[in-house]
Interface confidence: low
Amino acid sequence: MKVLQEPTCVSDYMSISTCEWKMNGPTNCSTELRLLYQLVFLLSEAHTCIPENNGGAGCVCHLLMDDVVSADNYTLDLWAGQQLLWKGSFKPSEHVKPRAPGNLTVHTNVSDTLLLTWSNPYPPDNYLYNHLTYAVNIWSENDPADFRIYNVTYLEPSLRIAASTLKSGISYRARVRAWAQCYNTTWSEWSPSTKWHNSYREPFEQH
């Protein structure tokens, strides 16, 4: 049994890091493998992660971490029984994938303005709370070409757009994702999408 593709890990910078790797053949990850991880720190203890299958030869493990700070460094040991298959290390702050924003809501009761709001996925005491920026994706269910991205570079989790920038009388969907420049993170997954019917009063035509 050998590791074909070494584990790569990403952290949500809160409580979970996810490591994925590939074996050289079909593997029952949960019965055959264990990923041991330990914070490089005097009083830390080794923890064991039981991996799950992720495709025939792929494995994924969700590492639980108490709290993550920028200096944290973990040793990783991948075992098959008594055989050490791979040894490495992982610094969560250097491989951050933020949590996806939640509770995306479209408020259509503001005159001719669409207000999109969502929730910051981090608690206020987490470092990323004040460092997230967002991308909002809006698209038409009827017209695949009507697809747009709005970059929200301020901290407030909201976006206002004029309803007239979208077509009237049709349905739209929106979703939002986050990233943090401070840790050069990857983008989060998209939030669940929300749907609304866009309608607004056309201004009187000028003759």
Epitope: L42, L43, A71
Partner: antibody, heavy 120, light 107 residues
Framework: EVQLVESGGGLVQPGGSLRLSCAAS????????MSWVRQAPGKGLEYVSA????????YYADSVKGRFTISRDNSKNTLYLQMSSLRAEDTAVYYC?????????????WGQGTSVTVSS | DIQMTQSPSSLSASVGDRVTITCQAS??????VVWYQQKPGKSPKLLIY???YLYTGVPSRFSGSGSGTDFTFTISSLQPEDIATYYC?????????FGGGTKLEIK
């Protein structure tokens, strides 16, 4: 404001005992790793002992192992160092520090220190 | 035990000078190195953690770098209030160990 206030130091004869206390305030003591660091007169810093947040894991430098005991009372926000079989070489200023805090491995908060003199 | 060899043990510099202190570990300690400042009669203060991260509230003239076995602490422009002894500290190996200190004086 974060404060660590040590007490319990003093003059003690070789072979004697002392109990140092460190009263913590201004941060969440119960979730913080804590440690004791000492500094002999005119010398550098020496790591003495550490304890995890719930008191379940402890660490001792070889020089104090078997003689010193670190403990904590999270209900009182207090860290302790029970020192026995004291030797002349234990003479030092003892600092209470927050060991892990927000930065692993770094002692971000230090007390003002309490002086221990072992002499006959 | 991992030895942290700090040099120089003392140095004298003028206000405005760039000051560099080095610390060499006897074996690889990754980036698990911290730098402290201790003024006479006072307790140490954290300046740099994880080899290169500036601690909250510490002036930007202080910086740290390095990984593995060689580490550097720099004051870009020495100020009168920087007179102190500086210590490096590794927490990668057990027991955690400190460098012998560098006493910094103003010329």
């Amino acid at each position: 404001e974060v404060q660590l206030v040590e007490s319990g130091g003093g003059l003690v004869q070789p072979g004697g005992s002392l109990r140092l206390s460190c009263a913590a305030s201004g941060f969440t003591f119960s979730s913080s790793y804590m440690s004791w660091v000492r500094q002999a007169p005119g010398k550098g810093l020496e790591y003495v002992s550490a304890i995890n947040s719930n008191g379940g894991k402890t660490y001792y430098a070889d020089s104090v192992k078997g003689r010193f005991t670190i403990s904590r009372d999270n209900s009182k926000n207090t860290l302790y160092l029970q020192m026995s079989s004291l030797r002349a070489e234990d003479t030092a200023v003892y600092y209470c520090t927050r060991q892990r805090g927000n930065y692993v491995g770094a002692m971000d908060y230090w007390g003002q220190g309490t002086s221990v003199t072992v002499s006959s | 035990d991992i030895q942290m060899t700090q040099s120089p043990s003392s140095l004298s510099a003028s206000v405005g000078d760039r000051v560099t202190i080095t610390c060499q570990a006897s074996q690889d300690v990754s980036t698990a190195v911290v730098w402290y400042q201790q003024k006479p009669g006072k307790s140490p203060k954290l300046l740099i953690y994880s080899a290169s991260y500036l601690y909250t509230g510490v002036p930007s003239r202080f910086s740290g770098s390095g990984s593995g076995t060689d580490f550097t602490f720099t004051i870009s422009s020495l100020q009168p209030e920087d007179i102190a002894t500086y210590y490096c500290h590794q927490y990668y190996g057990s027991p955690p160990t400190f460098g012998g200190g560098t006493k910094l004086e103003i010329k």
